[in-house]
């Protein structure tokens, strides 16, 4: 403000100087003096010029001082603060300092009292007032808008180890067992005890009639006969007890996150006040009352499951499941060692003629030659009608080989021709499972005996 005042005064003086010196001839007062007092005018003009020059010098010096003050002012950091509101009008400026005395003029007649001078121009705006005192504590704010959902909570720490489980309930009845796998070839059997009377077999081939003998004495028991065909399927065994429950299963995956809870209803908004003109920034008011709580954030992920609880006591055994279907019969075990002679038993009733066990062999070399089968106590051959590689494969498999080829005309055998029209698919485990004529029924001669070549 002071700068502005000084600059205004400077402009007035400059105008004065220019008018009185450079344009003196155009001034009416100058011309009047010139005409009224032509002799005095030159002397008076010279002295007046000196006064003006002195005043101009003083103005310039003041101007330089002002410039310095302006520099100080403009370089003040306060310049860059936010502009305050317009202050109240400043007080009337002080009366300007008295001008330097002019050179004495000729004594004039006493002047009348001059009219009152024009009112001075408004003073420059005064500086901002000091900062006001802290504002009064604000009223409680309106209820805040609903808070954004909270961030997902950090994973919880593992829960404590579960307590020992209570004793499990009795297991459910087990599912029906799967068909058992084919049994392995049995170990060498122990000498068997006397078998029960066999089921009635098919009528055997009629033997030649023997002469009727007289009833003989009880003979010593002979060595055990070759094992009979497998007996009828045994009765179903008692269900086994259910096995011990297995260890607990692995902890399941965490459940899916729950959905967010429903939002609370927002509070009513207060009526907005009309905006006031901003005052100078007051000191920070004390913290308003807490707004209503925002909507709850989503539930954090489940914590890591705690370690499994101690295994519960074994549950009571469940009811046994139904017995699985019997597995395929294993291969016939080797013949047992001959037992020691027991005491002679009482002669039993004569049983019906049963079938003997069956086995196969190759006559020629270990893996190539005539194919023979053992039935009803004697070895016999196979007729080559329908005999082909798929039949040979099954035959060879019975001897432990994995491959087989059918051969023909490998040399005539002797004795029985046990099989004819054997037709296997190649997947059977024994020839007895293949389609074929019944034992001993054929229309062949030994010239047609079948052969095989077997390979691992």
């Amino acid at each position: 403000v002071q700068v502005l005042n000084l600059q205004a005064r400077l402009r007035v003086l400059e105008m004065y100087f220019l008018n009185d010196t450079l344009a003196a001839e155009d001034s009416p007062s100058f011309s009047l003096l010139q005409s009224a007092h032509p002799g005095e005018h030159l002397a008076q003009g010279a002295s007046r010029l000196q006064v003006l020059q002195a005043q101009l010098t003083w103005v310039r010096v003041s101007h330089e001082h002002l410039l310095q003050r302006v520099d100080n002012f403009t370089q003040n950091p306060g310049m860059f603060r936010i502009k305050g509101e317009q202050g109240a009008p400043g007080l009337q400026g002080h009366k300007g300092a008295m001008g330097m005395p002019g050179a004495p003029g000729p004594p004039g007649p006493p002047a009348e009292k001059g009219a009152k001078g024009a009112m001075g121009r408004d003073g420059a705006t005064g500086p901002s007032g000091p900062q006001g005192p802290p504002g009064v504590k604000g009223e409680a704010g309106l209820q805040g808008p609903q808070g954004a959902p909270g961030k997902q909570g950090a994973t919880g720490t593992p829960g404590p180890q579960g307590e020992k489980g209570s004793k499990g309930d009795g297991g459910l009845i087990g599912p029906k067992g799967e068909t058992g796998t084919k049994g392995e070839k049995g170990d060498l059997g122990l000498p068997g005890s006397k078998g029960d009377r066999g089921m009635k077999g098919d009528a055997g081939v009629m033997g030649p009639p023997g002469a009727q003998g007289s009833k003989g004495d009880f003979g010593r028991p002979g060595p055990p006969g070759l094992a009979g065909f497998p007996g009828a399927k045994g009765d179903q065994g008692q269900p086994g007890l259910q096995g011990v429950p297995g260890p607990p299963g692995a902890v399941g995956h965490p459940g899916a996150k729950g959905e967010p809870g429903s939002a609370g209803s927002p509070g009513r908004a207060g009526l907005p006040g009309s905006p006031g003109s901003p005052g100078a920034t007051g000191l920070k008011g004390s913290k308003g009352d807490t707004g209503l709580q925002g909507q709850q954030g989503r539930k954090g992920e489940s914590g890591v499951p705690g370690p499994a609880g101690v295994k519960g006591e074994q549950g009571s055994p469940g009811l046994a499941g139904p017995k699985g279907a019997p597995g395929q019969a294993g291969q016939k075990g080797d013949q047992g060692v001959k037992g020691s002679s027991g005491e002679q038993g009482v002669k039993g009733e004569k049983g019906e003629r049963g079938e003997n066990s069956v086995s196969v062999r190759i006559v020629g070399s270990s893996n190539r030659g005539r194919a023979e089968v053992y039935y009803s106590g004697t070895w016999g051959t196979i007729c080559d009608d329908e005999w082909q590689n798929s039949d040979a494969i099954v035959f060879c498999r019975m001897l432990g080989y994995s491959k087989g080829r059918a051969l023909y005309k490998v040399g005539a055998g002797t004795g029985q021709i046990w099989l004819d029209n054997v037709q296997c698919r190649g997947t059977e485990s024994t020839l007895w499972s293949c389609t074929k004529n019944s034992w001993g029924h054929h229309d062949c001669s030994h010239e047609e005996d079948a052969g095989v070549e077997c390979s691992v």
């Epitope: 080829r405 023909y408 070549e453 691992v456």
Partner: antibody
Framework: EVQLVESGGGLVQPGGSLRLSCAAS????????MNWIRQAPGKGLEWIAL????????YYADSVKGRFTISRDNSKNTLYLQMNSLRAEDTAVYYC?????????????WGQGTLVTVSS | DIQMTQSPSSLSASVGDRVTITCRAS??????LAWYQQKPGKAPKLLIY???TLESGVPSRFSGSGSGTDFTLTISSLQPEDFATYYC?????????FGQGTKLEIK
């Protein structure tokens, strides 16, 4: 000692026919499977047909299936190969060979061969 | 068809040498394999069948081994009459196929 003698080879034009014979002796012909095997000049061996001792089963290589026919006459101890629709690539020495046994088996005796040339 | 591959295709050796020829099948043929010898202008002659069974009348210096896909013919001590071409042949399935042959020459 087994003897096998082929005959019937010669020069024939593409598309023509030829019948080869193999006379067997010194073994019981009717007890053995018989085969035809050929060898192109300077090349390897190629089995082409088999017939069982009783003529019940016959097998052919794909290269001749539908064009060649194997047969036998056990009363004459003779094996035959009827060749139709001959092609240049059928040019070869044709051998008859006896199987070790009555059907499909290794070739334990061979004839001396007969040359068939298919050319225009 | 089962492919039979012999190695080497040719071989030079001297009388008295031990020689080995190999044959590989493109799939397992068990032991259903034979070896034949053929001399120029002559018919082939069966040496070994079923992988390792020596045909009657064949000298014992010839032997065969192997099963599945890899087989070997060995001549323990070469004789002058052994210089010829040797073929392997599978008898596991139709069509019966031969190897391309191994020509054994005098060094």
């Amino acid at each position: 000692e087994v003897q096998l003698v082929e005959s019937g080879g010669g020069l024939v034009q593409p598309g023509g026919s030829l019948r080869l014979s193999c006379a067997a002796s010194k073994f019981t012909f009717s007890n053995y499977g018989m085969n035809w095997i050929r060898q192109a000049p300077g090349k390897g061996l190629e089995w082409i047909a088999l017939i069982y001792y009783n003529s019940n089963n016959k097998y052919y290589a794909d290269s001749v299936k539908g064009r060649f026919t194997i047969s036998r006459d056990n009363s004459k101890n003779t094996l035959y190969l009827q060749m139709n629709s001959l092609r240049a690539e059928d040019t070869a020495v044709y051998y008859c060979a006896k199987s070790l046994t009555g059907g499909s088996d290794y070739f334990d005796s061979w004839g001396q061969g007969t040359l068939v040339t298919v050319s225009s | 068809d089962i492919q039979m591959t012999q190695s080497p295709s040719s071989l030079s050796a001297s009388v008295g040498d031990r020689v080995t020829i190999t044959c590989r099948a493109s799939k397992s043929i068990g032991t259903f394999l034979a070896w034949y010898q053929q001399k120029p202008g002559k018919a082939p002659k069966l040496l070994i069948y079923s992988g390792s069974t020596l045909e009657s009348g064949v000298p014992s210096r010839f032997s065969g081994s192997g099963s599945g896909t890899d087989f070997t013919l060995t001549i323990s001590s070469l004789q002058p009459e052994d210089f010829a071409t040797y073929y392997c042949q599978q008898h596991d399935e139709y069509p019966f196929t031969f190897g391309q042959g191994t020509k054994l020459e005098i060094k």
